[in-house]
């Protein structure tokens, strides 16, 4: 969580603030979901480890025409230190496992909440 400053704000943003904004956006997506998210599009599952922000973006960037996750894609790009384009894959992808975007978002949300708690209390 060391490279989160300066994202989604005019000035430098403390890492916890940036992480909190991303979590809030994922909460909004899960709560406001009526029809299947992104028409049930499938994405590569990722390992939720150190480089997961770039890996998450690499997975989600391959979903096009889904306005519900556009803000999340933009936010993740602020968390990832390098440029990510469609078709790019890192070693963090579980390349034999695809899951629905809705499940991907839920898994990511749970993990980010855990990271947020750890950051608060440690």
């Amino acid at each position: 969580l060391t490279c989160l400053g300066g994202f989604a704000s005019p000035g430098p943003v403390p890492p916890s603030t940036a992480l909190r904004e991303l979590i809030e956006e994922l909460v909004n997506i899960t709560q406001n979901q009526k029809a299947p998210l992104c028409n049930g599009s499938m994405v590569w599952s990722i390992n939720l480890t150190a480089g997961m922000y770039c890996a998450a973006l690499e997975s989600l960037i391959n979903v096009s025409g889904c306005s519900a996750i556009e803000k999340t894609q933009r936010m993740l790009s602020g968390f990832c230190p390098h440029k990510v384009s469609a078709g790019q894959f890192s070693s963090l992808h579980v390349r034999d496992t695809k899951i629905e975007v809705a499940q991907f978002v839920k898994d990511l949300l749970l993990h980010l909440k855990k990271l947020f708690r750890e950051g608060q209390f440690n």
Partner: antibody, heavy 120, light 107 residues
């Protein structure tokens, strides 16, 4: 149904230590942060500190000058708050409270309270 | 530490009245604010979180608003069971801090 059940009332002498328990049911213990709140007779609410039950990491209010120790036992889904060097001003009801920071707030659920009386 | 200034400290109202309680933070708390109701001898009960989101099961006559440093709890039409003490809480940063409370009494 979420329940936070606290241990019973305590009477302590000045200088002693009290340890209160808070047993959780109805949700996964490690999913939510747990906090402790003090309420002196006829007074308002004061945050004492909190813990991430997953990691055991804590945060506490400097007002209590290191007298507060908060712990969590994942094997029993129970949180504990220990207050040492008790003085008469510590006579109060102590509440445990927890919740999802992003879905209801960190103080969504409350225990019934534990009255601690400090008297010589 | 962030100070939470709650006003009024007490008020008298009648059943059916519209009641407004305010909390002012000493700095921007990014809408990380909750409201609680407490009755004598009971634990506080959560009403509102994130400044304006109603907790499940809480009557719709309760509403929260505000942003930045200024927040409001409104009871649109006071019910007999609403006579109690109300507290705000900021959870934007540690140490979390409560307002001093507002006692709503029967006129």
């Amino acid at each position: 149904e979420v329940q936070l059940v606290q241990s019973g009332a305590e009477v302590k002498k000045p200088g002693a230590t009290v340890k209160i328990s808070c047993k959780v049911s109805g949700y996964t213990f490690t999913d939510y942060e747990m906090h402790w709140v003090q309420q002196a007779p006829g007074k308002g609410l004061e945050w004492m500190g909190g813990i991430d039950p997953e990691t055991g990491g804590t945060a506490s209010n400097q007002k209590f000058k290191g007298r507060v120790t908060i712990t969590a036992d994942k094997s029993t889904d129970t949180a504990y708050m220990e207050l040492s060097s008790l003085r008469s001003e510590d006579t109060a009801v102590y509440y445990c409270t927890s919740g999802d920071y992003f879905g209801g707030g960190p103080f969504a659920y409350w225990g019934q309270g534990t009255l601690v009386t400090v008297s010589s | 530490d962030i100070q939470m200034t709650q006003s009024p400290s007490s008020l008298s109202a009648s059943v059916g009245d519209r009641v407004t309680i305010t909390c002012k933070a000493s700095q921007d708390i990014n809408s990380y604010l909750s409201w609680f109701q407490q009755k004598p001898g009971k634990a506080p009960k959560s009403l509102i979180y994130r400044a304006n989101r109603l907790v499940d099961g809480v009557p719709s006559r309760f509403s929260g608003s505000g942003s930045g440093q200024d927040y409001t709890l409104t009871i649109s039409s006071l019910d007999p069971e609403d006579f109690a003490t109300y507290y705000c809480l900021q959870y934007d940063e540690f140490p979390y801090t409560f307002g001093g409370g507002t006692k709503v009494e029967i006129k």
